[in-house]
Interface confidence: low
């Protein structure tokens, strides 16, 4: 028997520095977790102790903090090279700055193979990107070889900006021939490494003949055997065992997100490359693991540019941006309108001639808006200003919901109106009318939504049975502020871009902003 140790990360999302337990900014260093310096300590410790070790990343290193905003992927290549990753799969967020934003900072700079079997380049891009990413890579490990085959969510064109010259094929259809090719090369130990979410990971394990292990990402799935060490609730045991259609037991793993854990999987293969045992658990990278001093020093050096950036002007406002709780928790506020407009703008994807855009709606809990911005400071808006408005380090995500769920959400928005509670919704692409004289649960008297399948966008009544795409904070997608119906009834959830980054990019693009209160939210009775 031959033993392989797979160390893996996924959905790190720009968390190069250590973070608090909830993966936001580190405040009390003695209780902070993750970060590349701490990760390196643990990886090196395992490399020294065990003979056959692979360090893999399942995508979405890009996007999530000011590190990505400033360094645009150069930081990913630099620190992944320093940690000596063996391979990475492309995630959807790797395309957030377009194909160029992937090629220049990462694909050309990485000293490790970057993989995806189901992304096919066409047209002029085909020759430009040729060889910069691969469908698979055969890696020597000790006296053996291991094949790594990559995959990426086929939803990427709706979630990011890959352009028109990349085709995202069905994962299973694309993977099978590549695995077959590896078999003809006498590679009998094959890992599928990719970024399509836990459901697809399990399907790959079931359907793709010849895949021995699946290392996934995208769904931020936490798996654990035994008592979990932090706040994350396991979605199943680690590894999660899938019985393939040809009767094999295939381990599937994922390691939550944000570099909080290092996935640790030990696989035993027989001489024919069959998995005979698999066990392990994610390792919580808490403060009991010291940060590596050389990597930490490098982080501190790169950090200097970030501090300078956060005080630079992004753009100007010529109006007061009312982010006060007195406004945003009671009525339409122009800060809410600004943020929602930025959220929609960030999701403009012209993927179908019948649709002006794939999504037109935004909802945002008023309680998530934490500060106004005064225009009398020369109109200047900085990253620092925006960090006061959106201090929680969340993301603006894409969900699919039935109209009936949206209706429930808007009823919940005003079910205890008047108590300055955070669930009052700010909106974009939605016109809502409330009648507060009616009983809670029956206060939405009009709910019109902006069409997407139209050349001239206009507002139509919400249809209860129709499925709509909506951009909203991850906090709401996860049922925060009592929006349990969203969490319970959402039909799809894809995590999006860092909230501050979305708004800062929009302001930089617009240069001068003047959001108004324009009748998106109305009250049919009372003095509102």
């Amino acid at each position: 028997a031959w033993e392989l140790t797979i160390l893996h990360t996924n959905d790190v999302h720009s968390r190069l520095e250590q973070t608090s337990e909830d993966s936001s900014k580190c405040v009390n260093a003695s209780r902070c977790m993750g970060g590349v310096a701490r990760l390196f300590t643990k990886v090196q410790q395992i490399r020294r102790a065990e003979p056959n070790v692979l360090l893999l990343d399942a995508g979405d290193q890009y996007q999530g903090t000011i590190w990505f905003t400033v360094y645009k992927g150069a930081e990913v290549a630099h620190f992944m090279n320093a940690l000596r990753y063996d391979a990475m799969a492309l995630g959807n967020h790797e395309f957030d700055n377009g194909v160029e934003g992937l090629i220049e900072p990462l694909l050309k700079e990485a000293k490790f193979p970057i993989l995806s079997a189901n992304i096919k380049a066409k047209g002029p891009l085909a020759s430009q990107i040729s060889g910069l990413y691969l469908p698979y890579k055969v890696l020597p490990v000790g006296d053996e070889v291991v094949g790594i085959v990559g995959y990426t969510s086929k939803e990427t064109p709706f979630l990011s900006n890959p352009g028109t010259n990349l085709v995202f094929e069905d994962e299973i259809t694309a993977l099978q021939p590549e695995v077959d090719k590896l078999k003809t090369l006498n590679v009998n130990k094959i890992i599928a490494l990719g970024h399509s979410g836990f459901e697809m990971d399990k399907l790959i394990a079931q359907k793709v003949r010849g895949v021995d292990v699946v290392v996934g990402g995208h769904s931020n799935t936490f798996l654990y055997t035994g008592n979990p060490p932090s706040k994350e609730v396991p979605a199943g045991k680690y590894p999660f065992i899938v019985t393939s259609d040809d009767g094999r037991k295939v381990p599937v793993v994922q390691a939550y997100a944000f570099g909080k854990y290092l996935g640790y999987l030990k696989i035993e293969f027989d001489e024919r490359g069959n998995v005979i045992s698999s066990h392990g658990n994610p390792i919580l990278l808490n403060s009991s693991i010291p940060e590596d001093p050389s990597i930490k020093a490098d982080i501190n050096k790169w950090r200097i540019k970030l501090d300078n950036y956060s005080t630079q002007e992004l753009g100007k406002t010529i109006v007061y941006l009312d982010g006060s709780s007195q406004s945003c928790r009671f009525r339409e506020c122009n800060m809410g309108n600004l943020i929602c407009d930025a959220m929609i703008n960030n999701n403009l994807r012209h993927t179908d001639e019948m649709f002006w855009n794939h999504v037109s709606m935004c909802i945002l809990n008023g309680g998530g808006i934490r500060s106004p911005i005064d225009e009398r400071n020369n109109g200047t808006i900085t990253w620092e200003n925006l960090a006061a408005v959106l201090p929680f380090g969340g993301t603006f995500d894409l969900v699919q919901l039935k109209g009936s769920t949206l209706k429930k959400a808007f009823e919940h928005s005003v079910h205890r109106y008047g108590q300055s509670t955070g669930e009052f919704l700010q909106v974009g692409g939605i016109h809502v009318v409330y009648d507060l004289s009616r009983k809670p649960g029956d206060r939405v008297v009009k709910l019109d939504v902006l069409c997407t399948k139209c050349r001239v966008p206009s507002y139509d009544p919400l249809k209860m049975d129709e499925v709509y795409k909506v951009i909203l904070p991850n906090f709401l997608a996860n049922g925060g502020d009592g929006f349990q119906m969203i969490k319970d009834e959402l039909l799809r959830h894809d995590s999006g871009d860092q909230d501050i980054n979305v708004v800062s990019t929009y302001i930089s693009k617009m240069k001068v902003i003047y959001p108004a209160v324009e009748g998106r939210i109305k009250f049919s009775t009372g003095s509102h």
Epitope: S404, K487, D488
Partner: antibody, heavy 119, light 106 residues
């Protein structure tokens, strides 16, 4: 440990209103994410979800019974109350209260209380 | 509302047998399905949630699978204490249950 106990009348007359109380321990309905629901089961028949209430007083009802049901909570007493108006013999069932988990499945149940509707 | 059609409504099996119960949802419920065991005069007990995850303390002979509209519940080796009625429940929209499968020993 988590326990739930239902209490209320064993017999109600047709057209009357049924009031059931669920008294629980081992968790608090003021904790974010907590919910308690009611499910009933007519003799020899399947289970039917009726209503549930969340920590923040958000309430959900089975649409086919919504007009007859009211759910409320008293956090300080660790109680949830369900009222059902205009009772009919077809409402004869064992009524259970249960703690609703992260999604909408129920891990902890009371032992149930049999309510018979008869004149 | 979403109907859950469970089959068979009753079945008889011997100790050690592999037992399979199926449940079909009237529309896509993704993996939002739970399975319960109910013994006479007792409250139901959850065995499986999210279609395939065993609840803590549930013996490994119980398993679940499926997604979308078709779900399967399996007892790999029937034990005498498994005699009960089993229910599926979807929670993609407001909860609805299957009509139950009564399991008896031959």
């Amino acid at each position: 440990q988590v326990t739930l106990r239902e209490s209320g009348p064993a017999l109600v007359k047709p057209t009357q209103t049924l009031t059931l109380t669920c008294t629980f321990s081992g968790f608090s309905l003021s904790t974010s994410g907590m919910g308690v629901g009611w499910i009933r089961q007519p003799p020899g028949k399947a289970l039917e979800w009726l209503a549930h209430i969340w920590w923040d007083d958000d309430k959900y009802y089975n649409p086919s019974l919504k007009s007859r049901l009211t759910i409320s909570k008293d956090t300080s007493k660790n109680q949830v109350v369900l009222t059902m108006t205009n009772m009919d013999p077809v409402d004869t069932a064992t009524y259970y209260c249960a703690r609703r988990e992260r999604w909408a499945w129920f891990a902890y149940w009371g032992q149930g209380t049999l309510v018979t509707v008869s004149s | 509302d979403i109907q859950m059609t469970q089959s068979p409504s009753s079945l008889s099996a011997s100790v050690g047998d592999r037992v399979t119960i199926t449940c079909q949802a009237s529309q896509n419920v993704f993996t939002n399905v739970a399975w319960y065991q109910q013994k006479p005069g007792k409250a139901p007990k959850v065995l499986i949630y999210s279609a395939s995850y065993r609840y803590s303390g549930v013996p490994s002979r119980f398993s679940g699978s499926g997604s979308g509209t078709d779900f399967t519940f399996t007892i790999s080796s029937l034990q005498p204490e498994d005699i009960a009625t089993y229910y599926c429940q979807q929670y993609n929209s407001y909860p609805t249950f299957g009509q139950g499968t009564k399991l008896e020993i031959k």
